[in-house]
């Protein structure tokens, strides 16, 4: 409940909020969980704590890990966890699932796309917006405050939208990008029994002990907007939330994408600092809609290193 996934790209700013509710006047102490080492509050540090916020200015891949925040009120101390993953910049235009924020849906009447997490940053308008990595141009697109409005939305407008803005901290500027999928509600839709695209059933994925790994559960459910279409991960037949291991988290938002006109939903299971015991678990990708439930199982195995003489 009080563990939150956050992610960003190297050399960009990342600001994370402690997942515990409280007043701005409360003292919040931040620690790097693995070492219990306190995060400094001095702003001259690249990574520093500022009340409920933890700031990476800019972030590095090595910053990935679990951070503990302790919110100290006059009456109680409350603990939360921020599970931070910093990824290398992608060389091509493709934005992988694990960097995507929750999907938004639009129609002719309502086509607002909000820039995710922007409220945490000190930014000034205007935002820059890109679709599938191309800068948006033309009078149909209006960047307004923290969101993009698209006039006369068409099915072609579905896709991945990236907002880019500058965070300012003490006169220094840092770039931030965030991407989310936009789907267009299609009245002429239909639904099918779920088809799981990934993982393949009874697949085995090789992983390195101590490294992070991501498992994507992806399924298609029909064409157009779906009344009920959900994908989720289970561990040994149990919900992720019932499995009290903060290293293993399912991303909050489910990303919706369209493949050949089909409505497909993805969710990513993030496993930090893979341990031997993770290899013993059964990971089930579940896809559910009104037609029924489909399940694909994947297991993890230790990566074999081939030594050539």
């Amino acid at each position: 409940k009080f563990s939150k996934q956050s992610w960003g790209l190297e050399n960009e700013a990342l600001i994370v909020r402690c997942p515990r509710q409280g007043k701005s006047s409360y003292i919040v102490d931040w620690y790097y969980s693995q070492t219990n080492k306190s995060i400094p509050t001095q702003e001259r540090n690249r990574v520093f704590a500022s009340g409920q916020l933890l700031k990476f200015l800019p972030a590095e891949v090595a910053d990935s890990g679990i951070y503990t925040c302790i919110v100290r009120s006059p009456t109680f101390n409350r603990t939360g966890y921020a599970n931070v993953t910093i990824y290398k910049k992608q060389p091509d235009c493709n934005v992988p699932d694990y960097l995507m924020y929750s999907t938004v849906s639009g129609s002719e009447k309502n086509s607002k796309i909000y820039c995710p997490t922007i409220d945490l940053y000190n930014w000034t308008a205007p935002l820059e917006w890109f679709k599938n990595c191309q800068a948006l141009q033309g009078s149909r697109y209006k960047a307004h405050k923290s969101f993009l409005v698209i006039d006369n939305v068409m099915t072609d407008d579905a896709g991945d939208y990236t907002c880019k803005f500058i965070h300012n901290e003490n006169g220094a500027n840092y770039s931030v990008t965030a991407t989310r999928s936009f789907t267009v509600k299609d009245e002429q839709g239909f639904s099918l029994f779920p088809v799981i695209r990934a993982p393949a059933h009874n697949e085995t994925k090789e992983v390195e002990i101590g490294e992070n790994t991501n498992l994507t559960c992806s399924a298609c459910f029909g064409k157009g907007a779906q009344f009920l279409a959900t994908v989720q991960w289970q561990l040994n037949g149990n919900k992720i939330t019932d499995f009290s291991e903060p290293r293993i988290q399912q991303e909050e938002g489910q990303n919706q994408s369209f493949s050949n006109g089909l409505a497909c939903v993805n969710t990513v299971l993030r496993i930090a600092d893979v341990k031997e015991e993770d290899l013993l678990l059964r990971y089930d990708c579940l896809a559910l809609n009104l037609h029924g439930l489909r399940r694909h199982t994947i297991r993890l195995s230790r990566k074999h290193h081939h030594h050539h003489h």
């Epitope: 007043k23 009120s73 109680f76 409350r78």
Partner: antibody, heavy 117, light 106 residues
């Protein structure tokens, strides 16, 4: 030592309103949250809601959304609970309690509200 | 809305005996549960906060355990001064009290 002072009792007519007060000593109420809890005679505890006195933000349990109004005056270090359209169901002891967002630690002695004609 | 089912409604024990009270929630709330004691004519008193944390000054005969949806509050070697009503409180989603358990001595 933190103390929360509440009036002992209120007798009110059905259909009327009542405003209960809770004054803190040795503690600045704007530094934490003030919760209100209802306890009917020989019954259990019911959480009414919480207020952040510093900024006036409130959150109510769905059951009390239309019944209760929480306010606070930081200058007098006092929190208030107003109950409207009173019926016999509102006859209860009402506690104020200081705490954080998630729980209460310091409690007042409670105000007994009796609704009777 | 998260609901809490507390049991038993009442129990009677002899001094020195062990008391066990259970609360079950309808949703997974991790360990965000608190335990209160209320003696007749007094306001409730917080004994145990979330994460099974004993509050300062509370005797070690009181303890709690549980995670997810199933929680247990225990009094080892019950004393006569422990006669009271006991309530669990979940604060994962809004705040909800259990219905309470009345503890009496035989």
């Amino acid at each position: 030592e933190v103390q929360l002072q509440q009036s002992v009792a209120e007798l009110v007519r059905p259909g009327a309103s009542v405003k209960l007060s809770c004054t803190a000593s040795a503690f600045n109420i704007k530094d934490d949250y003030m919760h209100w809890v209802k306890q009917r005679p020989e019954q259990g505890l019911e959480w009414i809601g919480r207020i952040d006195p510093a900024i006036g933000n409130t959150e109510y349990a769905p059951k009390f959304q239309d019944k209760a109004t929480m306010t606070a005056d930081t200058s007098s270090n006092t929190a208030y609970l107003q109950l409207s359209s009173l019926t016999s169901e509102d006859t209860a002891v009402y506690y104020c309690a200081l705490g954080d967002f998630y729980a209460m630690d310091y409690w007042g002695q409670g105000t007994s509200v009796t609704v009777s004609s | 809305e998260t609901t809490v089912t507390q049991s038993p409604a009442s129990l009677s024990v002899a001094t020195g005996e062990k008391v066990t009270i259970r609360c079950i929630t309808n949703t997974d709330i991790d360990d965000v549960i608190h335990w209160y004691q209320q003696k007749p004519g007094e306001p409730p008193k917080l004994l145990i906060s979330e994460g099974n944390t004993l509050r300062p000054g509370v005797p070690s005969r009181f303890s709690s355990s549980g995670y997810g949806t199933d929680f247990v509050f225990t009094i080892e070697n019950t004393l006569s001064e422990d006669v009271a009503d006991y309530y669990c409180l979940q604060s994962d989603n809004m705040l909800t009290f259990g219905a309470g358990t009345k503890l009496e001595l035989k």
